[in-house]
């Protein structure tokens, strides 16, 4: 069967959609891809909760799923021929949309090593138990299925769509209906956040009367990173209801005029934005939301803030706190890298010293340089080291092999060198003869 939707959860800069349908992983990915997304990533506990929320929404709509233990594809796959790596959180699997490996994982059980076929991951839902934030769906690994044969207990899949930003839902100040159409072709009347490039159709009125008024808006980028509909004031306002309907569509305060008209207002410390509905903190940084050495930076118009970290630090997943960047992961040094708080330090192996072309480079120490040689006699420099040598008649000695010791040729391993007497000298030897004998011209024999 094809994929039916559909449940949608939009949060941050992404929307997650859950679909029921017995599709293979490839068919599911193709379905997400056609609308500009991918099978969902689950890169953190927070993201796992978003995915769980969208699945819970889907399950409320689906009357009966066939299996008690149902599986829903996510975008984690391992290609044929790529082996399991138990040391990694993702075990050698990777996200279909690309992106780096992440530390979060939630495997159902120990994985079996198999490199002979492609493997895909699904979320395992026990439908006999309620979905709780404390009990996130486990990751189940298995075959990826094929058209018409998705695999056992596969009931659907979850897509993820990423956006530049989101708009707030439109505020209605009187009876009416908003229908959002997202860029990924989903229509919904209730979204917590509405993705960039979505359209909103607003039909004002009770529905049974002809006096319905309609409006059309697009969620667009009004200024850098400022996403808005461009509507000003609450929509579908009605003197009949005044502030009594949905607080007049106002974010905070609603003030009625005597003629049935009304205006939105804000509490102390807040100000009304251009849409004449929303209130924003006069200075969102005043509550010191940033931690751990992070600086609070105001966004344009003072509407929002971001935390900025000092050099050598980066924001953690909360986007509020700073954590040390491990610069050594990028291998900035030629030899050894030592990560330090807010930075790093390059070190060289024994026999090398800092220097040479490029940052963090190491060059060979010339141990044999004039006035530096550790050897008693000959010294030869090598890459990262050196070795000593001795003149003829001497051998290397000492624990570190830098000294030269005289060879006693008179007790050499080949036996006596002289026919008669042998006299050892520094670095050499000479032969002698007993009284009455004369040393022959060869310097060894006695005649």
């Amino acid at each position: 069967t094809g994929a039916d939707t559909e449940a949608v959860v939009c949060v941050g800069t992404a929307c997650y959609t859950a679909h029921s349908g017995k599709l293979s992983a490839a068919e599911a990915q193709n379905h997400c891809n056609q609308n500009g997304g991918n099978l969902a990533t689950v890169k953190s506990k927070e993201e796992a909760q978003h995915v769980q929320r969208v699945l819970a929404q889907l399950l409320r709509r689906e009357a009966a799923l066939t299996a008690r233990m149902s599986k829903f594809w996510i975008g984690l796959q391992r290609e044929k021929g790529k082996c399991l790596d138990p040391s990694l959180p993702l075990k050698g699997f990777s996200w279909v949309g690309g992106g780096e490996d992440t530390p979060y994982s939630n495997w159902h059980k120990e994985l079996r090593n198999s490199c002979i076929s492609k493997r895909c991951v699904s979320l395992l839902l026990d439908l006999s138990q309620p979905l709780l934030p404390s009990r996130l769906p486990k990751w189940s690994e298995g075959p990826c299925g094929s058209p018409g044969s998705p695999g056992s207990n596969i009931e659907g899949f979850v897509c993820k769509f990423s956006f530049k930003g989101m708009c707030r839902p439109l505020a209605l100040g009187g009876p009416g209906q908003v229908t959002y159409t997202t860029p990924f072709q989903t229509t919904s009347s209730s979204l917590e956040a509405v993705p960039f490039a979505s359209a909103a159709n607003v039909a004002c009125g009770e529905g049974d009367k002809d006096e319905t008024q309609s409006h059309y808006f697009l969620c667009k980028e009004k200024a850098p990173d400022v996403f808005d509909w461009g509507s000003s004031g609450p929509l579908c306002v009605s003197p009949k209801y005044g502030c009594n309907f949905n607080n007049g569509g106002c974010h905070q305060d609603c003030f009625e005029g005597g003629d049935g008209s009304f205006l939105c207002g804000c509490r102390p410390g807040f100000r009304l934005l251009d849409d004449l509905v929303t209130c924003a903190s006069r200075n969102p940084c005043s509550s010191s939301p940033c931690r751990g050495g992070a600086t609070c930076v105001l966004g344009p118009h003072g509407k929002n803030y971001t935390c900025r970290c000092p050099q050598g630090y980066q924001l953690d997943s909360s986007q509020l706190d700073c954590v040390d960047v491990d610069e050594c992961q990028d291998s900035p040094c030629a030899q050894e890298c030592v990560n330090t708080p807010g930075g790093f330090r390059c070190e060289c192996w024994v026999g090398y010293e800092p220097g040479g072309p490029g940052e963090g480079a190491c060059q060979d120490v010339d141990e044999c340089a004039l006035g530096r040689s550790p050897c008693a006699q000959g010294c030869t420099n090598t890459d990262g080291s050196f070795h000593c040598s001795c003149e003829e008649g001497y051998v290397l000695a000492g624990e570190d092999g830098t000294q030269c010791q005289d060879v006693d040729e008179c007790v050499g391993p080949g036996g006596p060198l002289c026919d008669s007497l042998c006299f050892n000298t520094q670095g050499s030897f000479h032969c002698g003869c007993l009284p009455g004998w004369v040393l022959a011209p060869n310097g060894v024999s006695c005649t």
């Epitope: 697009l218 667009k220 200024a223 990173d225 461009g230 930076v297 966004g299 344009p300 929002n304 971001t306």
Partner: antibody
């Protein structure tokens, strides 16, 4: 290729109004802001409004609010700029300019000279 | 509104020599997303303006690499490494961080 073609020069009386058109082609008309910038003779550039053709959303420079109206016709990919209650200070070349995804004004029309005579 | 001051008003340059134009803004153009929303445009004699540099330092398509942009949150510089005869015209800086978008007063570059 992207093109913005504006209507011809206009000479109008003081106190009257003028309507300048800008026909866009070569890109997705509904998905980009169209800005209007004017340049008085020998002077610099002044932004005075923009429209998002996708839904007709507009923003105006407060200095001109109430005098300027921007409308779009998606069937012909044309934007119209109407300026009312003209004075000699409104004599200028009026440009329509596309705003791109980097917030740059990347394509400019050839300009329309509006001369306000007393 | 964000106000900007451009200098010099006029810049006579010998061909082959470098040139530099400054622009100072009344508030920072550095957004919390790390992007600086500062732009440079050139209006050649008798023509419509054309985009040279976007977001402070990025060269627009088809612009020669002798042009470069740099700066901090409020002070910006457009540099031409070797001026050519075709570079004459009026250079404008502009901000697109907050509405209304605003332009500098312009710097007229002429050949000595």
């Amino acid at each position: 290729q992207v093109q913005l073609v504006q209507s011809g020069a206009e000479v109008v009386k003081s106190g009257a109004s003028v309507k300048v058109s800008c026909k866009a082609s070569g890109y997705a008309f509904s998905s980009y802001w169209l800005n209007w910038v004017r340049q008085a003779p020998g002077q610099g550039l002044e932004w005075f409004g923009r429209i998002y053709p996708g839904d007709g959303d507009t923003d105006y420079n407060g200095k001109f609010k109430g005098r300027v109206t921007l409308i779009r016709d998606t069937s012909t990919s044309t934007v119209y700029m109407e300026l009312t209650s003209l004075t000699s200070e409104d004599t200028a070349v009026y440009y329509c300019v596309r705003g791109d995804g980097y917030w740059a004004m990347d394509y400019w029309g050839q300009g329309t000279l509006v001369t306000v005579s007393s | 509104d964000i106000v900007m001051t451009q200098s010099p008003l006029s810049l006579p340059v010998t061909p082959g020599e470098p040139a530099s134009i400054s622009c100072r803004f009344s508030q920072s153009l550095l957004h919390s997303n790390g992007i600086t929303y500062l732009y440079w445009y050139l209006q050649k004699p008798g023509q419509s303006p054309q985009l040279l540099i976007y977001q402070m330092s990025n060269l627009a398509s088809g612009v020669p690499d002798r042009f470069s942009g740099s700066g901090s949150g409020t002070d910006f510089t457009l540099k031409i490494s070797r001026v050519e005869a075709e570079d004459v015209g009026v250079y404008y800086c502009a901000q697109n961080l907050e509405l209304p978008w605003t332009f500098g007063g312009g710097t007229k570059l002429e050949i000595k």
